[in-house]
């Protein structure tokens, strides 16, 4: 149970992180291109890894045209990082009623990342409550 | 059917600044972002930059930063570059091209403008 | 930037021909190349995307190929109205670039 619980901390700092980097993304909002991203909301239930997934394939880019170039694209690669999986993530992988990627709505940048930040929010908070009722499975 | 319509030919003077229109029919305008192209002598073609319709955002190649400004009319579904400082290095014929988007990706430019001819002469 | 390098900058060639255009990256662009047609008078026209799909209404005879830095285009059995200019692009990084172009003529 011991690394099974580390595994879950470890998904639970990446997650964190995550949502450190999309914040800091946002202040450079004006230097990414605008262009339209697939921007999952209001993703059903047991779909968020799916949802999590198109957001780590959206072509988001750096206009390269500023003194933040570096920053924003060695965020722009931390934010592609594989989380550390976990069992209800392993389960979710295997469903395939779950919307595709072109399908969601298409947002730019600064709407895409408030998404993106709003999905990390939901499945930290689903974690900690399947944690709390002693299954991993929400 | 898609088209985007261009203003026409400018003959210009050194130091002037100028605007050309890109009006769109035919599709969704604040779906697609729309880019500027620059063609040099008919040949070399340069990316200029972009404009999202949908908010107004732009961005740049770092070698027409301050030289062109991209805008927009959603009312009249037309986008506009201004070019500024204008140099004889600046006669070219400029194009608008619409954005191809495929699935989630997007992937070149689909829809191009007939150009407008730029000549920048005293 | 990314430099496009395409060759040749000339071909000339024959109706029922198949001809190759060729475009090297600086570096690594992954799949994301564009090809274009453009002829006077007429609006560019966009051929293929994203390495080797093929734009909806292009003819089948256009097809690309290649990943990361080495592209081909290749038009088999050329047509007359094929003889025209063309370009590749990168859609991988920002600033966008072109290739210097290639004008197929008739031989």
């Known amino acids: 149970h011991k690394s099974s619980s580390q595994g879950q901390d470890r998904h639970m700092i990446r997650m964190r992180q995550l949502i450190d980097i999309v914040d800091q993304l946002k202040n450079y909002v004006n230097d990414l291109v605008p262009e339209f991203l697939p921007a999952p909301e209001d993703v059903e239930t047991n779909c968020e890894w799916s949802a999590f997934s198109c957001f780590q394939k959206a072509q988001l880019k750096s206009a390269n045209t500023g003194n933040n170039e570096r920053i924003i694209n060695v965020s722009i690669k931390k934010l592609k990082r594989k989380p550390p999986s976990t069992n209800a993530g392993r389960r979710q992988k295997h469903r395939l009623t779950c919307p595709s990627c072109d399908s969601y709505e298409k947002k730019p940048p600064k709407e895409f990342l408030e998404r993106f930040k709003s999905l990390l929010q939901k499945m930290i908070h689903q974690h900690l409550s399947s944690r709390t009722h002693g299954s991993e499975d929400s | 059917q898609v088209q985007l319509q261009q203003s026409g030919p400018e003959l210009v003077k050194p130091g002037a600044s100028m605007k050309i229109s890109c009006k769109a029919s035919g599709y969704d305008f604040t779906g697609y972002t729309m880019n500027w192209v620059k063609q040099s002598h008919g040949k070399n073609l340069e990316w200029i930059g972009l404009?999202?319709?949908?908010?107004?955002?732009?961005a740049y190649s770092p070698k027409f930063k301050g030289k062109a400004t991209l805008t927009v009319d959603k009312s009249s579904s037309t986008v506009y570059m201004e070019l500024l400082s204008l140099t004889s290095e600046d006669s070219a014929v400029y194009h608008c091209a619409r954005t191809h988007y495929y699935g989630s990706e997007y992937t070149g430019m689909d829809y191009w403008g007939q150009g407008t001819s730029v000549t920048v002469s005293s | 930037d990314i430099q496009m390098n395409q060759s040749p900058s000339y071909l000339a060639a024959s109706p029922g021909e198949t001809i190759t255009i060729n475009c090297r990256a600086s570096?690594?662009?992954?799949?994301?190349i564009a090809w274009y047609q453009e002829k006077p008078g007429k609006t560019n026209k966009l051929l293929i995307y994203?390495?080797?799909t093929l734009q909806s209404g292009i003819p089948s005879r256009f097809s690309g190929s290649g990943s990361g830095t080495d592209f081909t285009l290749t038009i088999s059995s050329l047509e007359p109205e094929d003889f025209a200019m063309y370009y590749c692009?990168?859609?991988?990084?920002?600033?966008?670039?072109f290739g210097a172009g290639t004008k197929l003529e008739l031989k």
């Open positions: 994203a390495g080797g």
């Open positions: 404009i999202n319709p949908y908010n107004g955002g732009t």
């Open positions: 692009q990168q859609h991988e990084e920002y600033p966008l670039t």
């Open positions: 570096k690594s662009i992954e799949k994301y």
